[in-house]
Interface confidence: low
Amino acid sequence: EVEKTACPSGKKAREIDESLIFYKKWELEACVDAALLATQMDRVNAIPFTYEQLDVLKHKLDELYPQGYPESVIQHLGYLFLKMSPEDIRKWNVTSLETLKALLEVNKGHEMSPQVATLIDRFVKGRGQLDKDTLDTLTAFYPGYLCSLSPEELSSVPPSSIWAVRPQDLDTCDPRQLDVLYPKARLAFQNMNGSEYFVKIQSFLGGAPTEDLKALSQQNVSMDLATFMKLRTDAVLPLTVAEVQKLLGPHVEGLKAEERHRPVRDWILRQRQDDLDTLGLGLQG
C-alpha cells in the first residue's frame, strides 16, 4: 500500500468547518479524521466544498464503512449523495422516511437518477410494501414514479396508499398498470358517495371493466371525452349507445370529433346504425 502523506503541523481538523474549503485534496485526506467526518456530516452540506473535495470526503467514509454507511450518516449526506454510485447505495439499509426525503431533496429538480432509483428500491424493499406515506413522498418528488413500476411491483401497493395518488401521477401509466391499480382504487374509495367517488376514481378508469362502466352510466357522472378515450377498448365495445350516452351526458357530442380514433372508432363499428342515429351526430357505422 502507498504510504499516506502526513498531516502538516497545525492543520489537523478538530471539527468540520469552512476552513477546510482551503485544504488541498491531499490535506483533506491526511488531516480529516473519518470518524469526525461521520459525526459531523450535517455540517458538510452547509459548506461549499468543490466536487474534488467531496470525492475525498466520500473516500474517507468508504474506508470507515466498507460494508455500507449507517443511517445516521446517510441522512446527513446532503450533496455528497450525488457522488454515490448505485453500488454504494445497494449496501445501505435505509428505514427512515425522513432520510429518504432528505436525499430526494438533494436531487430535486432533476430527473430520477440511477442513484435515486436504487435508493427508492432499497427503501421500498426494506419496508415490504409501498405504504401511503412513502407513496406520498415519492410522488411529490417524482409525479411519474408510480407509472415507472412494473405491474408486479404495483401489486404490493395497499389500497390505503391509493389516497396519496394524484391524477398527474397516472399520466404515463399504461393499461397493464391501470389494470392493477384500478381494483385497488375501487376498494379504497368504495365508501364514498356517487359524485365524490367518480372524481376520485376517474384517473384510474383506464383499468375498469365493462360492468363497472355500465354501473357508472346509471349515475349521471358526465364523463369527459379525455377520460373516455383512455378507457380500455375491450371494456367499451360491449356498451350500448344508450349506455355511452348516459355515461358521457352533455359530452356525448365530442364523439363526432373522435370518430376515427380508438376506442370510439371500434365502438361505432359494433353499433347498429339506427341506434347511432338516435344520437343525432351523423356517426356512420
Epitope: 471539527e15 468540520i16 474549503i21 459531523q40 461549499p48 430535486k108
Partner: antibody, heavy 121, light 112 residues
Framework: EVQLEESGPAVIKPSQSLSLTCIVS??????????WHWIRQPPGKGLEWMGR???????YYSPSIKSRFTISRDTSLNKFFIQLSSVTNEDTAMYYC?????????????WGQGTSVTVSS | DIVMTQSPSSLAVSAGEKVTMSCKSS????????????LAWYQQKPGQSPKLLIY???TRESGVPDRFTGSGSGTDFTLTISSVQAEDLAVYYC????????FGGGTKLEIK
C-alpha cells in the same frame, strides 16, 4: 463587473404561467460556492424569498410557495429562470434576482434592478 | 420555517441622531461549529434594489459607512446607525441564511 438583469412580461392575466429570466454578466453562474436567488416584493410590502439554484445545480424553494414555482438555469447562456404557474393577483410584485456568496459572506452581495409584474385581467 | 420579526415597523428621527432597530429569529442562527451567526442586514432605498450592509451579524460590507453597526447573537440582533444622515432614508431588512432564507418584515426609517 458583476451585473444581474431581470426580464419578463410587465402584465399577465390571472391563471396564466409567468416566466422570468435573470441574465448574469461578468461572472459565471457555475462558479464554485455561489448561489442564485429569486426574491419578490409586492407593492408596498416587504421582501419574500422564493428560492435559489446553486453552482452545482441544486435547487431549493421556499416551503410556503414551492408547489407553484420552478427554478432552472441555462449554463451555456449564463442565465437562470423562475416559472410561476396559475398566477393570481397576489403574484403582482417586483421580482429581483440576486447572487449569494456562500463562502465568504453567506449573503446576497449583488442584486438586479428588478422587473415589475402586474397580474390583471 | 425560521420566522424573522423586526421592530419597530417604522421610526422617525432627526439627522445626527442615533437609531437602533431590532431583529429577532424564532430559532438560534448561531452555528456552534463555525461560531458564526447567519444573519444579514439589507438597506432598500425608495425605488431601488436592496443593498447588503452587514453579514454574519456584525461584518460590514465593503463600502458601507462605519456609522452602520450590526450586533447580537443567537436569536436577538440589532442594527445601529450612530449618526443618521438624510441619505439613510430607507427600509432596513434582516435576513437569515441558517436554514433556507427568510426576510424580516422590515423597519422603515424616516427623517424628521
Amino acid at each position: 463587473e458583476v451585473q444581474l438583469e431581470e426580464s419578463g412580461p410587465a402584465v399577465i392575466k390571472p391563471s396564466q404561467s409567468l416566466s422570468l429570466t435573470c441574465i448574469v454578466s461578468g461572472f459565471s453562474i457555475t462558479s464554485s460556492s455561489y448561489c442564485w436567488h429569486w426574491i419578490r416584493q409586492p407593492p408596498g410590502k416587504g421582501l419574500e424569498w422564493m428560492g435559489r439554484i446553486c453552482y452545482e445545480g441544486s435547487i431549493y424553494y421556499s416551503p410556503s410557495i414551492k408547489s407553484r414555482f420552478t427554478i432552472s438555469r441555462d449554463t451555456s447562456l449564463n442565465k437562470f429562470f423562475i416559472q410561476l404557474s396559475s398566477v393570481t393577483n397576489e403574484d403582482t410584485a417586483m421580482y429581483y434576482c440576486s447572487r449569494e456568496n456562500r463562502l465568504l459572506k453567506d449573503a446576497m452581495d449583488y442584486w438586479g434592478q428588478g422587473t415589475s409584474v402586474t397580474v390583471s385581467s | 420555517d425560521i420566522v424573522m420579526t423586526q421592530s419597530p415597523s417604522s421610526l422617525a428621527v432627526s439627522a445626527g441622531e442615533k437609531v437602533t432597530m431590532s431583529c429577532k429569529s424564532s430559532q438560534s442562527l448561531l452555528s456552534s461549529r463555525t461560531r458564526k451567526n447567519y444573519l444579514a442586514w439589507y438597506q432598500q432605498k425608495p425605488g431601488q434594489s436592496p443593498k447588503l450592509l452587514i453579514y454574519w451579524a456584525s461584518t460590514r460590507e465593503s463600502g458601507v459607512p462605519d456609522r452602520f453597526t450590526g450586533s447580537g447573537s443567537g436569536t436577538d440582533f440589532t442594527l445601529t446607525i450612530s449618526s443618521v444622515q438624510a441619505e439613510d432614508l430607507a427600509v432596513y431588512y434582516c435576513k437569515q441564511s441558517y436554514n433556507l432564507r427568510t426576510f424580516g418584515g422590515g423597519t422603515k426609517l424616516e427623517i424628521k
